[in-house]
């Protein structure tokens, strides 16, 4: 058994608040423009920091109509704040050779929100493996 | 060390409110986030929310919405949870708990709320 | 909203003994699970997170096991000072605690 580090893991600090993040995203749904948006799935291992970047650049926003405008662009720059570095060495990372942005697939924001998660998941699965 | 000092007890009439601080020490403030937790005489464990140190952002459980308000003042490393429209069932024990990441890994030394006329 | 129910309510062991404890979740909630110990008049501590894994300082014979919506908390043998109740708790969806689970000397 690991212990928890005794020095702050920024890294796991900061998935772990933007699962939270998605989740209140997930709750105001239907206050999301309906435009489709880039959704990265089956992403493989040495790339979850590339497609999380592409979930980032994604123009997922309020719509015109939809209440709670200020409170969803809050949530949205806190998506958007850049993640911490790795604690260990990323040379594998730099090496792959990870899909653009363009070549996933296009989903409503429900979908995409499900996406990120299951992404956000797999990172923190991934960062305690 | 990580310390939460928390303020103390507060006895309370019915539609009044109430703001418990938990002051935090031993690690840098804005690096954690904050949840608040309470537990009724006798009863279980019930998340309130929780919020950010460095933001002002804040989550609410459904239930205390409209209630609660979640706030810190990063000069002093306190957070602050208000409970308005006090009613009797929510007598109890509230905890400030530090979130840590993947769980309240510290826990202040609760406040208890008591609500009576 | 996610529930947590956790089995036996209370239970009534000796010094020793091997003590089980579980926890299910009303929808699949991953790895996504702490414990925690609460003794009378205390603030709860923290035993283990993530499922398995043993916070700073906790001792080795407090053990996590499960995923998905079926989850176990074992003392592989009872301390005198293990008599408190245990709370589980899903972070999967915002947090939800069960009902705790009392240990009380037989």
């Known amino acids: 058994h690991k212990s928890s580090p005794q020095r702050p893991d920024h890294l796991l600090i900061r998935l772990r608040h933007l699962m939270d993040i998605v989740e209140q995203l997930k709750i105001y749904e239907n206050d999301l423009d309906p435009e489709l948006l880039t959704a990265p799935q089956d992403v493989k291992g040495q790339c979850e920091h590339e497609a999380f970047a592409c979930f980032q650049k994604a123009k997922l926003k309020p719509s015109n109509t939809g209440n709670n405008k200020t409170f969803i662009n809050d949530l949205l720059a806190q998506l958007r704040r850049r993640l911490p570095a790795k604690r260990t060495g990323n040379k594998q990372r730099h090496m792959a050779k990870c899909p653009s942005c363009d070549l996933y697939e296009k989903k409503t924001p429900k979908e995409f929100l499900e996406r990120l998660k299951w992404l956000l998941q797999k990172m923190i699965h991934q960062h305690l493996s | 060390q990580v310390q939460l000092v928390q303020s103390g007890a507060e006895v309370k009439k019915p539609g009044a409110s109430v703001k418990v601080s938990c002051k935090a020490s031993?690690?840098?403030?804005?690096?954690?986030?904050m949840h608040w937790v309470r537990q009724a005489p006798g009863q279980g464990l019930e998340w309130m929310g929780l919020i950010d140190t460095s933001d002002v952002y804040t989550i609410y459980n459904q239930k205390f919405k409209g209630r609660v308000t979640m706030t810190r003042d990063t000069s002093t490393s306190t957070v602050y949870m208000e409970l308005s429209s006090l009613r009797s069932e929510d007598t109890a024990v509230y905890y400030c708990?530090?979130?840590?990441?993947?769980?309240?890994?510290?826990w202040g030394q609760g406040t208890l709320v008591t609500v009576s006329s | 909203d996610i529930q947590m129910t956790q089995s036996p309510s209370s239970l009534s062991a000796s010094v020793g003994d091997r003590v089980t404890i579980t926890c299910r979740a009303s929808?699949?909630?991953?790895?996504?699970l702490n414990w925690y110990q609460q003794k009378p008049g205390k603030a709860p501590k923290l035993l283990i997170y993530?499922?398995?894994r043993l916070h700073s300082g906790v001792p080795s014979r407090f053990s996590g096991s499960g995923s998905g919506t079926d989850f176990t908390l074992t003392i592989s043998s009872l301390q005198p000072e293990d008599f408190a109740t245990y709370y589980c708790q899903q972070f999967h969806t915002l947090r939800t605690f069960g009902g705790g689970t009392k240990v009380e000397i037989k």
């Open positions: 993530y499922t398995s």
């Open positions: 929808q699949d909630i991953s790895n996504y």
């Open positions: 031993g690690y840098t403030f804005t690096d954690y986030w």
């Open positions: 708990a530090r979130y840590g990441p993947l769980a309240m890994d510290y």
